[in-house]
């Protein structure tokens, strides 16, 4: 015989027509409605009655279509673990956390649970840009030609070498991956002890 149009309906093969919004209840061998995100099962279904859902209380949530009899407790982002909040908890979604600036996710269990300080990139390198901030530790790559980075830092970016001619100066010493170009006044000789500086 054809199953009923709406839950609860009998299921011979232990599967339901809409797997997202229905679930199989094995005791009565029926398919019942799940509760939508932001709600929980207030009253279980029976052979005659469908599931009754109720809204999650404040500071609790359920993210998916479910047949949970409770809502999950909202948890704050733990600053001790290096996390910060980017979106508050709602009845339909847990608190959204990310690693604090200068940190990366060192422990992942469905979501980030622990952040650690990003490693410094030495002079002459910079951290490779990632698709998602805080996803992994720094991978340091050399500055590309015409750029330099002169500190040990987790976040400093390689900068283009100064073009002396743009300032009406001339090059005294070429830039390297770790230092900027040294410029001088075209009329003045460069003292030997003043390398890596720009003379006005």
């Amino acid at each position: 015989s054809q199953p009923q149009a709406v839950p609860p309906y009998a299921s011979e093969n232990q599967t339901c027509r809409d797997q997202e919004k229905e679930y199989y209840e094995p005791q009565h061998r029926i398919c019942c409605s799940r509760c939508p995100p932001g709600t929980y099962v207030s009253a279980k279904c029976s052979r005659i009655r469908d599931t009754v859902c109720a809204t999650c209380a404040e500071n609790s949530y359920n993210e998916h279509w479910n047949y949970l009899t409770i809502c999950q407790l909202c948890r704050p982002c733990d600053p001790v673990m290096g996390l910060e909040e980017i979106a508050p908890c709602t009845s339909k979604r847990k608190t959204q956390c990310r690693c604090q600036p200068g940190m990366f996710c060192a422990a992942w269990a469905l979501e980030c649970t622990h952040c650690e300080l990003l490693s410094d990139c030495p002079p002459g390198t910079e951290a490779e840009l990632k698709d998602e901030v805080g996803k992994g530790n720094n991978h340091c790559v050399p500055c590309k030609a015409g750029h330099f980075q002169n500190t040990s830092s987790p976040s400093a970016r390689c900068q283009p070498h100064t073009r002396c001619e743009n300032q009406g100066l001339v090059e005294a010493a070429p830039g390297t991956a770790q230092s900027d170009t040294t410029c001088k006044n075209p009329l003045e000789p460069l003292p030997p002890e003043m390398s890596g500086t720009m003379l006005m």
């Epitope: 009923q4 009253a43 005659i48 009754v52 009899t69």
Partner: antibody, heavy 120, light 108 residues
């Protein structure tokens, strides 16, 4: 220990509306999981289910009575009520209120029942 | 409309075993529940989900099912077991609650 008590007039005239109230004591009618029900028993006969109600107002009715029956709930008074309109002598019965087992269609706690006679 | 059929009466002597049957086409699909009702009193649930016993119900009460028939068994019947017994389930489509017509158990 949850207890149920039916109350209402014992005599109703034909074509009028039968109104009964069930008061729940020893527990909250708003407890998660519990539906509440009305059942009746004609004199010397078997039991007949009338309907279910949840504290949020969700109802299920016996199809044979659906056109005449309304079950409502008043959580502030911890009560639920039965209204049966256009009554005839065939509605003369003992009316019971009962608590429904969560996830089942059975009744674990009953009121003692109240006799309602339909007569002019 | 859907019906559950019970024998009108069953008689047994004290200490014997009483068996009360309830038959209906939908019983293989749905759970059955049994109630005991003594004169002037409200029904009391004695068996739920075919064969489970609520707390406070003596062990001599048990339930079983086979095809379209379910059976309430009272072993070692006592005088206090004399009462009307009703089975209860759902109709074929699972739309409404149905009670059997009731069986009067007489303890001789």
């Amino acid at each position: 220990q949850v207890q149920l008590q039916e109350s209402g007039p014992g005599l109703v005239k034909p074509s009028q509306t039968l109104s009964l109230t069930c008061t729940v004591s020893g527990g909250s009618i708003s407890s998660d999981g519990y539906f509440w029900s009305w059942i009746r028993q004609h004199p010397g006969k078997g039991l007949e289910w009338i309907g279910f109600i949840y504290f949020t107002g969700i109802t299920y009715y016996n199809p044979s009575l659906q056109s005449r029956v309304t079950i409502s709930v008043d959580t502030s008074k911890n009560q639920f009520s039965l209204k049966l309109n256009s009554v005839t002598a065939a509605d003369t019965a003992v009316y019971y209120c009962a608590r429904v087992i969560p996830g089942e269609d059975a009744f674990d706690i009953w009121g003692q029942g109240t006799m309602v006679t339909v007569s002019s | 409309s859907y019906e559950l059929t019970q024998p009108p009466s069953v008689s047994v002597s004290p200490g014997q075993t009483a068996r009360i049957t309830c038959s209906g086409d939908a019983l293989p699909q749905h759970y059955t529940y049994w109630y005991q009702q003594k004169p002037g009193q409200a029904p009391v649930l004695v068996i739920y989900k075919d064969n489970e016993r609520p707390s406070g119900i003596p062990e001599r009460f048990s339930g079983s099912s086979s095809g379209t028939t379910v059976t309430l068994t009272i072993s070692g019947v006592q005088a206090e077991d004399e009462a009307d017994y009703y089975c209860q389930s759902a109709d074929i489509s699972g739309t409404y609650v149905v009670f059997g017509g009731g069986t009067k158990l007489t303890v001789l």
